[in-house]
């Protein structure tokens, strides 16, 4: 992982939605009983920020032990700290749980940088600000780790919400969400609204702030504006999707669309950045530089290393372009686009300059493992992981940060031919040596 971009190794304030609210549109899909409407008890159940991850409160064991757990759609293990660690305020104490069952099996998960390892077991798990159910789930009790937990992040474990195919040690270890759906009447769907603050939050502000919502089993109307647009889940391992076109300020990058998905494109709440394949990243940065050419920024800024500071309140958002990703639609030859603002891809960084400054890191970076639509993308949108119908929905988030001139957008339909050709078919040999790291 480079510069803490993949979380945990890869590297809003107040109760109201952050940023300016947008007017509601009325052209919504028909109601589906039990899956849409109001989920008041789950709204605002996430805290955190893009740089360190968004977490939900969970309880494990009997009597229940409360832990904060990172919500990660880019992995499939439920793993919690189970031994003292300098960065953990608390950890899962299996010996105190009367319902813990040891699976007598170890698990080792190496990342590009860092790792965690632990012991597998099962226990009773619930989500206080989630559905009113308790499930017996697989738990990896982390006994040793390196560069996994983040100092000051306030989470003690990770909830991998992707599919069994990428679970460790193998796909026989049932992920938490599969267990939840099997053991309860919760519909096979969840949705995420990640709310970037648009300004840096210190430790106490993060603890007091709302970071967003994870709606388990449904869709909450209050969390988005306009319509939901769906893209097929190409394959159930990661949440893999297909990007068919990329534009910077409306200018097509004009690359073979296979490049956008080389070797895959995934939606990953556990990654901070929008990560792009090398060729795509280089073309995108060139285009972003050209669009903002009245200014010159240091080379290290475009590498996500140096940060650029402006006097508080004077960040020239207007010189930075919008970025549009066109996703395969549900209908043949139809696509839709999601558009993010610099307010999403310039990530506020705290504790570096004076309080008179607003400082940012460039949150688009290079990838050798395909496109990763991380938190900076997800912070613009309400994202529905409709596992039941093998699709992912996007709508403009009610809490996304924007200005008076531009807003994030989800628009369609657009006619796009031969979209199936945009998908990259990973050779069988590569899949068997799947890289866990998201650097």
């Amino acid at each position: 992982t480079q510069h803490g971009i993949r979380l945990p190794l890869r590297s809003g304030l107040g109760g109201a939605p952050l940023g300016l609210r947008l007017p509601r549109e009325t052209d919504e899909e028909p109601e589906e009983p039990g899956r849409r409407g109001s989920f008041v008890e789950m709204v605002d159940n996430l805290r955190g920020k893009s740089g360190q991850g968004y977490y939900v409160e969970m309880t494990v064991g009997s009597p229940p032990q409360t832990l904060n757990i990172l919500v990660d759609t880019g992995s499939s293990n439920f793993a919690v700290g189970a031994a003292p660690h300098p960065f953990l305020h608390r950890y899962y104490q299996r010996q105190l749980s009367s319902t813990y069952r040891d699976l007598r099996k170890g698990v080792y998960v190496p990342y590009t940088q860092g790792k965690w390892e632990g012991e597998l077991g099962t226990d009773l798990v619930s989500i206080p600000h989630g559905p009113n159910v308790t499930v017996r789930a697989n738990i990896a009790a982390i006994t040793e780790s390196d560069k996994f937990f983040i100092n000051g992040s306030n989470w003690e474990g990770i909830l991998g919400l992707a599919y069994a195919e990428i679970a460790r040690p193998d796909d026989s270890l049932e992920p938490f969400f599969d267990s939840l759906v099997k053991q309860t009447h919760v519909p096979n769907l969840f949705s995420l609204q990640l709310c970037g603050a648009g300004f840096p939050l210190n430790q106490s502000e993060v603890l007091a702030s709302v970071g967003g919502s994870m709606i388990i089993g449904g869709i909450d109307h209050s969390l988005y504006t306009g319509s939901l647009w769906y893209t097929p889940i190409r394959r159930e391992w990661y949440y893999e999707v297909i990007i068919v076109r990329v534009e910077i300020n409306g200018q097509d990058l004009k690359m073979d669309c296979k490049e956008y998905n080389y070797d895959k494109s995934i939606v990953d709440s556990g990654t901070t950045n929008l990560r792009l394949p090398k060729k795509v990243f280089e073309a995108a940065v060139k285009s972003i530089k050209a669009a903002s050419s009245t200014e010159k920024f240091p080379d290290g800024f475009w590498l996500g290393e140096q940060l650029v500071c402006w006097q508080a309140g004077t960040t020239p958002w207007n010189i930075f372009p919008v970025i549009s990703l066109y996703l395969m639609g549900e209908v043949t030859n139809q696509s839709f686009r999601i558009t993010i603002l610099p307010q999403q891809y310039l990530r506020p960084v705290e504790d570096v300059a004076t309080s008179q400054d607003d400082c940012y890191k460039f949150a688009i970076s290079q990838s050798s493992t395909g496109t990763v639509m991380g938190a900076v993308i997800m912070e613009g949108f309400y994202v529905v992981f409709d596992r039941a119908r093998k699709r992912i929905g996007f709508a403009v988030s009610a809490c996304h940060v924007h200005d008076e001139f531009r807003t994030a957008a989800v628009e369609g339909p657009f006619v796009t031919l031969d979209m199936e050709d945009c998908g990259y078919n990973i050779p069988q040999t590569d899949e068997s040596t799947l890289m866990t790291g998201r650097a």
Epitope: T294, K296, F297, P298, G300, E305, Q306, L307, A353
Partner: antibody, heavy 120, light 108 residues
Framework: QLQLQESGPGLVKPSETLSLTCTVS??????????WGWIRQPPGKGLEWIGM???????WYNPSLKSRVTISVDTSKNQFSLKLSSVTAADTAVYYC????????????WGRGTLVTVSS | EIVLTQSPATLSLSPGERATLSCRAS??????LAWYQQKPGQAPRLLIY???NRATGIPARFSGSGSGTDFTLTISSLEPEDFAVYYC??????????FGGGTKVEIK
Amino acid sequence: QLQLQESGPGLVKPSETLSLTCTVSGGSISRGSYYWGWIRQPPGKGLEWIGMIYYSGSTWYNPSLKSRVTISVDTSKNQFSLKLSSVTAADTAVYYCARVGHGVSYFDLWGRGTLVTVSS
Amino acid sequence: EIVLTQSPATLSLSPGERATLSCRASQSVSSYLAWYQQKPGQAPRLLIYDASNRATGIPARFSGSGSGTDFTLTISSLEPEDFAVYYCQQAYVWPPRTFGGGTKVEIK
């Protein structure tokens, strides 16, 4: 070989405006790889960054001086200039112009400097 | 604001000796740090950039190391012309406006 040379009055009265010009020779100021900056050094003290400018006219200033500083560029003359208003004795210093290179992060080429004294 | 603290303030050495100058940042500046040399009556000159890269024309006896918060400028064997004041400067937070207070290397 690129050279920078500061010019301007060596004595300025308190409350007046200090004006300096940096002439770049041996290369074009319009080359997009660089910013052009001003740094000052009070007698016997350390270096203080004043601000910098890109050939497009985009400027960045030290917040502590921002209300009094204006940096401008004249690409036709291959020059950039500094104006510092409402000067006091605390503004007495050697003023250097410099090129900001190496990924526009470091001052890789400097003028010889000019001493400006603020006194009545 | 990132503060750069240089130590020692003065270093008294003889020609031929090894000089080790320190620059400590109040928080991490990654490897975005430069060293400058300033002789009396002259402008500063860039010696090292990005913590360890020698600028054009700088002799090999000058070397830089470190990352994060602790940086070192080493002059392996002092020549008479090396007695000067040395400044560090960070560029992690940009624009690059922070210099250290300087270390004077004087003849013992």
